[in-house]
Each structure stands twice: as C-alpha cells, then as structure tokens.
Amino acid sequence: AGVFELQIHSFGPGPGPGAPRSPCSARLPCRLFFRVCLKPGLSEEAAESPCALGAALSARGPVYTEQPGAPAPDLPLPDGLLQVPFRDAWPGTFSFIIETWREELGDQIGGPAWSLLARVAGRRRLAAGGPWARDIQRAGAWELRFSYRARCEPPAVGTACTRLCRPRSAPSRCGPGLRPCAPLEDECEAPLVCRAGCSPEHGFCEQPGECRCLEGWTGPLCTVPVSTSSCLSPRGPSSATTGCLVPGPGPCDGNPCANGGSCSETPRSFECTCPRGFYGLRCEVSGVTCADGPCFNGGLCVGGADPDSAYICHCPPGFQGSNCEKRVDRCSLQPCRNGGLCLDLGHALRCRCRAGFAGPRCEHDLDDCAGRACANGGTCVEGGGAHRCSCALGFGGRDCRERADPCAARPCAHGGRCYAHFSGLVCACAPGYMGARCEFPVHPDGASALPAAPPGLRPGDPQRYL
C-alpha cells in the first residue's frame, strides 16, 4: 500500500506565440481545480477507461479575476498535493491523465459551471520511495508544470511497496533470515505472509494471516468461483461453500454516482458510467463543450455545442484517442531496414542503425571500399558493412601495405627449399621432384610427370613461380 502524490507547480500560457485567452474575466471570475487519473502499465488506453490505480480531485484554487488588458499569467493554484492512495503493489510503470478544470463563479442559475481547460497525458516509469520527479506537459497553448512521486505507507517499503518493515525486537540485529529495512535501518524486513494456501491470483492480504478475496471469488482461501445461480438474493447468503457472494455493504450501495450516473462495482472500488454531458469519478463535473477546445493535435470537434450534448473529436491521420491525444504506432510497419531500431518521435520517424549501416532507414550498407584502394594491387571486397582487402601475392595486412613472407606458409612440397623473390617465391626442389611447388615426382627412367621442362631448365633446377 502507498500513496501517489502530485504537486502542481504552475499552470499558464506556454512559450511561443499565440498566448491563450485568460479563462476568467471580471464578469466571470473563476477558479481552477485539477483531476488526476492513474492507470497501471504503459497502456495507451482511452481517456475514459477506468482509472484502475485510482483518481483524485484537488481542492478549488483561489478565485481569479482577469485584469483587463493584461496577458494571461500563471493562474492561482489550489493548495496542497493531489494524493491517490493505492492498496496493492505499486506497478512501477503507469499512465497518467491530468486535467485542469475551470469553475466559473458568475451568477449562473443552478450554481457554478465547470469546463475542461486542458488535459495532458503521459506514460512513465517510477519506483516507489524515490525522489520527486519533475515534468512539463503542454496542452494546446497551455503549459502545466508538476512533480510527482510514489511513497509507501508503513509498514510497506521497497520500490513496489511489497516488503513490510517492523520495529526490531532486539536492538542489535534482525531475526533469522530477515534483513534490515533500508532506509529504515532500525527496522527489520518482515515478509507479508497471507493465510497458508491463500490463492495468489484471487486473494490478497493486508495483515499477516488473512486472506481477502477479489471480486468473483470466495471461500476461506479465495479458490471458489462465485456462482450466483444458487444465491437467494443479489448478494447471496453468507455461505462460503455455496460459492455465493457474502452479504454486506457494497461500494455502489447508496449510488455514489451523481447526475444520473450508473454505478458498477470493480474489484477494489466502484466505477460510474456517466450520462452525456457529465464527467468525473462520480459524474460530478459537467459542461465540456467544443468551445473548450478538448481536441488535441488538430482534431476537429463536432457536437457538444451545449453542456448537455457530448462532443466527438475527429482526429487527423496519425492521431487517436477520445481527444486525439495519442499517436498511432507507426513503427509497427517496421520501416527500418537491416535490423535498425524504429523510433517514433512524433514529428518524424527515426531509425537507429546497426553498425555498418546508415541512411534515414538504414538502407545504406556502408561502402568502405568507396574512396579507399587496397595497396600493391590488392582488390577490395565488401560484406556486411565491413571491408577487407584481397591482397596480391607477396603482400598482406588490412590494406595490403605489409610485405608478406611468401615462404611463411611453407609452400614447397617434398622438402623443397623456399626462397623469397621480388615477384613471388622460388622453390628449390629436393632430388626426385620438380614443378613450381616441387609437387611432381620425377619418374625413375628420367621422364617426369610434366610434359617437358621449360627450355633452359633441367629437372631439379630451382623453379621460379610467377
């Protein structure tokens, strides 16, 4: 268990031209508040999908009235942190949506009116217990600066808040098999042991020895799937053996959803399905219209002319999400060649090429032979982004610049002696052998296996190999 904490530092016009109009005026003073929605993992879920990790609403900020003629400054913010408690392990990777809402305080009939000013979304990795992480996000012409962290609630510790710490029983050391709890060195790690046999998939515990069931499972070890067919009432009798849900107050009892929203239970809480024109954890906010500019990235807003009708964002190619806030994964078409890594930077696709390849799509096999000759008559051979020189006889090395010892490989057969020569090598053959490499035996009758020795050379003479 633990708490995700969000600190809003500023909300105001972003850099660059086209400063936004102040959201408040002398005729219509207003104040801001923020909503944060957290989801586990790096999911690219729609903005309206459940905030499975939790959500929080800030207090209202100070009332602000625009000074006539003045540009929109950073707007006054609510005091304090937005805190989203989480009951289970911190997932380490999460998605967030932070919405900036405006509450107009004019003398409207029926109380204040709310409208969405900006929505930013992102995906992050974060270890619990770490320092505050700072972030800047832009939504249209607005800029939001904020910090966030996840911290564990005692006795939980660790990057996922899954380890428990207990005060030491002895002042000097922890019990057998238990480590000191960093950073609380005066405490000891205590493994959280649920009741023996408690289902790891369908049960959990907040205190050692207990076994609490997720929705849809029952029994002392949460191994019995709920079957409502034999139940006497919608919540069923309190018998674990029948596999019926245990009676008791449910999170939807009393319907926490405002403005005609319908409530459905989730494994850990409840979820409101709001009617058109209403929004928020409990359908408590309303009034998002196309006039509020809810569509990002050039999306076209249709409908939503008044707070009671829903708006729809028609996204330009390459964008999606209910507010066109998400980019389509263009890398799934695998445009990079030769094993390059695809990166979708938003404004462009980039390929990170493997060694030996280059070009916007890694399409060029680096031609190391271009512009570099192999010395001493060697020829360049390409392959796999590297090059090598096939050297002429008598030369070696990467560029054929080194004079090779032609006799190093002992090329003369049958005991012939090798002599280096400016044009190669010469073999002086042992008696009874002849040929450029002394490879041919001379027949006993004086004839050789070769047709005839070249003029001027008798069998047994040194033969020069050209």
């Epitope: 190619p317 390459g318 078409l333 695998q334 445009p335 990079c336 030769n338 696709l349 916007p360 799509r361």
Partner: nanobody, 120 residues
Framework: EVQLVESGGGEVQPGGSLRLSCAAS????????MGWYRQAPGKQREMVAG???????IYAESVKGRFTISRDNAKNTVYLQMSSLRAEDTAVYYC??????????????WGQGTLVTVKP
C-alpha cells in the same frame, strides 16, 4: 505531395470476402514500407498487414491465415485480400506508407480510410 487512395470497402456477411486497394501517387521516388491499419469504434488503431522496409510481409496475429497482402510495384499499389471475415473485423481500414520523396527525405503518409462492415 503524396496521396494514398483506398477503395474496396463495403458491407459483407460473416464468412465473406473483400479486397481493398490502396494506390500511392505524387512525388514518390520509392516506397519503403506500405500496409494496412484498422480502427474499430472506441479502439486503438492497429497494424493489420504490411510490407516492411526489408520487403517482408507482416500480419497481425488476429488476421493470420485469413488476410493476404500483395502489391503491384509498377502501380505503387497494395492490396488486402480479406477472407473468412468476422464481426470483429468491422473497422475503418487505413492505408499507410513510408515513402522516399524526390527530395530524398522520407515521410509517413495515411489514407483517408475505407469502412468495412461485417454483419449478418
């Protein structure tokens, strides 16, 4: 400027077939990668089938064995033959292409989409 023009969408019964076409035109030096994405109502846009930069064919797991992608290089056109269609294949199908322009730059383009509806 590059245009991708899709055609071939329509309404079909479950188990039926459709063939989508996408023709690329404009200041194209070469087509690096080209394929099809789809977006069902309320869902994310997903890659369905394509020719990668390496020239390999790739398919989403959900369409393997039912959809076949092919191309006509001379016409800068790709085709998606869809067979054994199911209700869950209902979506707007978008053509996508990673193109090398005459300027030698690469750009990624989308078509406007063609609607495929599978219903009894």
């Amino acid at each position: 400027e590059v245009q991708l023009v899709e055609s071939g969408g329509g309404e079909v019964q479950p188990g039926g077939s459709l063939r989508l076409s996408c023709a690329a035109s404009g200041s194209i030096l070469s087509i690096n990668a080209m394929g099809w994405y789809r977006q069902a109502p309320g869902k994310q846009r997903e890659m369905v089938a394509g020719f990668t930069g390496e020239g390999n064919t790739i398919y989403a797991e959900s369409v393997k064995g039912r959809f076949t992608i092919s191309r006509d290089n001379a016409k800068n056109t790709v085709y998606l033959q869809m067979s054994s269609l199911r209700a869950e294949d209902t979506a707007v199908y978008y053509c996508a292409a990673d193109v090398q322009l005459f300027s030698r730059d690469y750009e990624f383009y989308w078509g406007q989409g063609t609607l495929v509806t599978v219903k009894p």
